[in-house]
Interface confidence: low
């Protein structure tokens, strides 16, 4: 017994005074604890614990299961122990078959011996299979066999404790090692959709998938900048031994505008954390926003093509689209398609293809679109540029020469006098009167201009040219006249197109 100075409490003394005691099965175990402040005996083996308040522990007929550590404790909390082996050739091992090991840690195969004098205390694989080459273990007859640094590859390994007794190998009951994987990476998290757009009252449901090596991964849905507890449902699966998947589904059964915001799926394990977010936007009602992809005022030359293109955002999805001109709906020549195939897409494109436009086809082209909540429209004003066309050219009864031309943009009419038979008319003549005839109407069709000059100003034979022109082209008409004595002869008008 350890020596102590007088007055200082000392641990109890045990008889027999040795650390280990070996008895045969059926023999008596008699242990005496001597201490003025005796409190109790405690017996421990595997998960079993027994107590005895008598200072003498007597087991009349020892059994293998009486093998274990006997501890005597006094009132000062000081204790002394003796380990008793009850040798039973028919029961060499005490076993607790539950065997769990954490990856990279040591784990104990709990198969303490009832006889410390057997040899070759070790582990063996089941059915004669060899143990993994890298498996290291340390035997301890009182505790079992410690497997060092458990590997993930040992999961579901079947093994026995083994000893040699009288030259023969004796095996314990079998153990199945269950390895709890260590987290060596952060969880993998993903979300069903990155953004959601809903109307008030609709259900919001989003699923986060968490993948890790075991179910011990922690996950939760959180609202950013909020501590409100969220209602979520879980489903989980083990796809093989170290491939765990959990689906955490967050649901708001009737979303409100103030539910809008960013929701985070957060997961962590002992290695670290990961998160993924989804954005919810709740609107009080649906909407449509139209964006013209070209100017809404369009100028196009006669005979050319033009595409009227709009992009629009529509939520909920558009139900009716149409292009209209002069109160008529186009049944073809247009197409409407989503901007993207993404499930969250709310942006669409509509194109009206106008081909070989005539001067008479200028005007307002309107795109209309509607969904279950709203209607929207956008108008394009299309102007068709046409070269001037001379509608009339005449000598009026009052002696005036009149020329009327139509085109877009508005034509300009110039007058020229050509003396004699010359074809080049260079001397310009100022008109007496110029009028735009239809300026009060909508400015989509051709504009008609009328110009007049006084023929009495001409004193010589010759030709008068009326030239109408705009940005697109020009057209001319001619008046031929001659003097006979003092009288002018009949004027003969004719036209000449000048490209």
């Amino acid at each position: 017994q350890p020596s102590v100075s007088p007055g200082e409490p000392s641990p109890p003394s045990i008889h027999p005074g040795k650390s280990d005691l070996i008895v045969r099965v059926g023999d008596e175990i008699r242990l005496l604890c001597t201490d003025p402040g005796f409190v109790k005996w405690t017996f421990e083996i595997l998960d079993e614990t027994n107590e005895n308040k008598q200072n003498e522990w007597i087991t009349e007929k020892a059994e293998a299961t009486n093998t274990g550590k006997y501890t005597c404790t006094n009132k000062h909390g000081l204790s002394n122990s003796i380990y008793v082996f009850v040798r039973d050739p028919a029961k060499l091992f005490l076993v607790d078959r539950s065997l769990y090991g954490k990856e990279d840690n040591d784990t104990l195969v709990r198969c303490p011996l009832t006889d410390p004098e057997v040899t070759n205390y070790s582990l063996k694989g089941c059915q004669g299979k060899p143990l993994p080459k890298d498996l290291r273990f340390i035997p301890d007859p009182k505790a079992g066999i410690m497997i060092k640094s458990v590997k993930r590859a040992y999961h579901r390994l079947c093994l026995h404790c083994s000893v040699d007794q009288e030259g023969k190998s004796v095996l314990s009951e079998k153990f199945i090692l269950k390895v709890r994987p260590a987290f060596k990476a952060v969880p993998v998290v993903s979300v069903s959709k990155a953004s959601y757009l809903l109307r008030e009252g609709e259900e919001f449901t989003v699923t986060c998938t968490i993948k890790d090596v075991s179910s011990s991964v922690y996950s939760t849905w959180k609202r950013e900048n909020s501590q409100t507890k969220l209602q979520e449902k879980y489903n989980s699966w083990h796809h093989g031994d170290f491939n765990y998947e959990r689906q955490a589904t967050l649901t708001i059964s009737s979303a409100r505008v103030n539910d809008s915001g960013v929701f985070m799926c957060y997961a962590n394990n002992t290695f670290g954390s990961a998160n993924v977010t989804t954005t919810l936007e709740v609107v009080d009602k649906g909407f449509i926003n139209i964006f013209p992809m070209i100017n809404t005022t369009v100028f196009v030359n006669d005979g050319e093509n033009v595409d009227l293109i709009v992009e629009y955002e529509a939520f909920p999805k558009p139900e009716h689209q149409q292009w209209i001109y002069m109160n008529r709906t186009f049944t073809d020549k247009w197409e409407d398609y989503p901007k993207s195939e993404n499930e969250s897409n709310i942006r669409y494109v509509s194109e009206l293809h106008l081909t070989r436009l005539k001067g008479t086809e200028g005007g307002t082209y309107t795109f209309l679109v509607s969904n279950s909540d709203v209607n929207a429209a956008i108008a394009f004003n299309v102007y068709v540029n046409t070269k001037p066309e001379i509608l009339t050219y005449d000598r009026l009864v009052n002696g005036m020469l009149q020329c009327v031309a139509a085109g877009f943009p508005e034509p300009t009419i110039d007058w020229y006098f050509c003396p004699g038979t010359e074809q080049r008319c260079s001397a310009s003549v100022l008109p007496v009167d110029v009028q735009t005839l239809n300026s009060s109407g909508p400015p989509f069709g051709k504009l008609v201009v009328q110009s007049s000059i006084d023929s009495s100003a001409f004193k010589h034979n010759g030709t008068v040219e009326c030239k109408a022109y705009n940005d697109v082209g020009k057209t001319s008409a001619y008046f031929n006249f001659a003097f006979k004595g003092n009288n002018k002869e009949q004027i003969h008008p004719h036209t000449l197109f000048t490209p």
Epitope: Y100, R180, S214, S215, S216, Y218, S219, T220, K229, L230, E232, Y234, N235, S236, W237, H238, R246, T270
Partner: nanobody
Framework: EVQLLESGGGLVQPGGSLRLSCAAS????????MSWVRQAPGKGPEWVSG????????YYADSVKGRFTISRDNSKNTLYLQMNSLRAEDTAVYYC??????????????WGRGTLVTVSS
């Protein structure tokens, strides 16, 4: 070594209440999701309720929703199940389990030895 020790079971009349406790040791309790699982006589195990490591998330089987409340005290390493409005069909052995598996065949990593709850008049 992980240990889970349930207590608080007993005989109670229909409509009555019980509070189960589960004392945990041998692991970092505050790091793990915990569950209650029950097994009625002659039936297979049934997952009852689960709680996240920080107690922020709780979830329940439809059969107990609104009647049972799961909670935990990480400072005491203890898991609780408050059972109200008990019915005869709640009679079972109640196990405390580590992990959040929804179906028993997935197996929990560790579980206790159970405490018996009997609901009978």
């Amino acid at each position: 070594e992980v240990q889970l020790l349930e207590s608080g079971g007993g005989l109670v009349q229909p409509g009555g209440s019980l509070r189960l406790s589960c004392a945990a040791s041998g692991f970092t309790f505050s790091a793990y999701t915990m569950s209650w699982v029950r097994q009625a006589p002659g039936k297979g195990p049934e997952w009852v309720s689960g709680i996240g490591p920080d107690g922020f998330i709780t979830y329940y089987a439809d059969s107990v929703k609104g009647r049972f409340t799961i909670s935990r005290d990480n400072s005491k390493n203890t898991l609780y199940l408050q059972m109200n409005s008990l019915r005869a069909e709640d009679t079972a052995v109640y196990y405390c389990a580590q992990g959040d598996s929804r179906s028993w065949h997935n197996s929990f990593d560790y579980w206790g030895r159970g405490t018996l709850v009997t609901v009978s008049s």
